[in-house]
Amino acid sequence: HHHHHHHQGWQAFKNDATEIIPELGEYPEPPPELENNKTMNRAENGGRPPHHPFETKDVSEYSCRELHFTRYVTDGPCRSAKPVTELVCSGQCGPARLLPNAIGRGKWWRPSGPDFRCIPDRYRAQRVQLLCPGGEAPRARKVRLVASCKCKRLTRFHNQSELKDFGTEAARPQKGRKPRPRARSAKANQAELENAY
């Protein structure tokens, strides 16, 4: 999991997907960073079916799953007055190939070819009210909630931090938008994939 430095004016939350965003009418698209597959706990029955970027009959080879969860947004001792629901992107994209195991006689499932990741694709900005102990006044904040996930390809550019959509040769630049730092928490709970579609 990538540890992200904290930048002034950006608050980190417990979840790897949600973060506070500046009080702006418009905000830039997130830089396409890798998401941690180990996210919130106890998400089951993975929402929508996986993306199918490759021509294949074996759907089980793809595991970009959208797992939903529900939680209260926290910022230090403060907690949102109302809970939120959002998605966790989990799994690995692309067909796994059966490669010989150098140790012993067995075979291992290992990915080969381009490095694809299942990461957030769309976000929704939502306003939440944070309630703090000690008689502090409630604070209104905007958070970005993950609304969908997508398989994207890791490239060698930008220190391997830029991702391409499946099936595209080049990443599409966003006009007039600059990537911005994202504050992240390093600690997240394990997502359990049970009975996933």
Epitope: E44, G46, V84
Partner: nanobody, 117 residues
């Protein structure tokens, strides 16, 4: 606008079961994520479980393996089956609705669950 009404609460002995029902009015019910929450005396409200329109479920650790959330979109209902109840499950149980990737903005009035030891 969706409106929610909970029912099914009551007094039960430890180890017993209850089935809570969240009944919704509103044509768009099926598109909402529905969550169950609970609030014990003197404590903050906490998440119990939630379910999306497609049936994807989420459980907090407190109810994992004991509680089951389900929904019937045709009847505009969401259920919380609670088994192996414990005294610490005593609380007012609320259901709430949220748009996907959104805030739970619509709440029911709650139903009291009391588990005696």
């Amino acid at each position: 606008e969706v409106q929610l009404v909970e029912s099914g609460g009551g007094l039960v002995q430890a180890g017993g079961s209850l089935r809570l029902t969240c009944a919704a009015s509103g044509r768009t019910f099926s598109s909402f994520v529905i969550g169950w929450f609970r609030q014990a005396p003197g404590k903050q409200r906490e998440v119990v479980a939630s379910i999306t329109s497609g049936g994807s479920t989420y459980y907090e650790d407190s109810g994992k393996g004991r509680f089951t959330i389900s929904r019937d979109n045709a009847k505009n209902r969401v259920y919380l089956q609670m088994n192996s109840l414990r005294p610490e499950d005593t609380a007012v149980y609320y259901c709430a609705a949220a748009e996907p990737a959104g805030v739970y903005d619509v709440w029911g009035q709650g139903t009291q669950v009391t588990v005696s030891s």
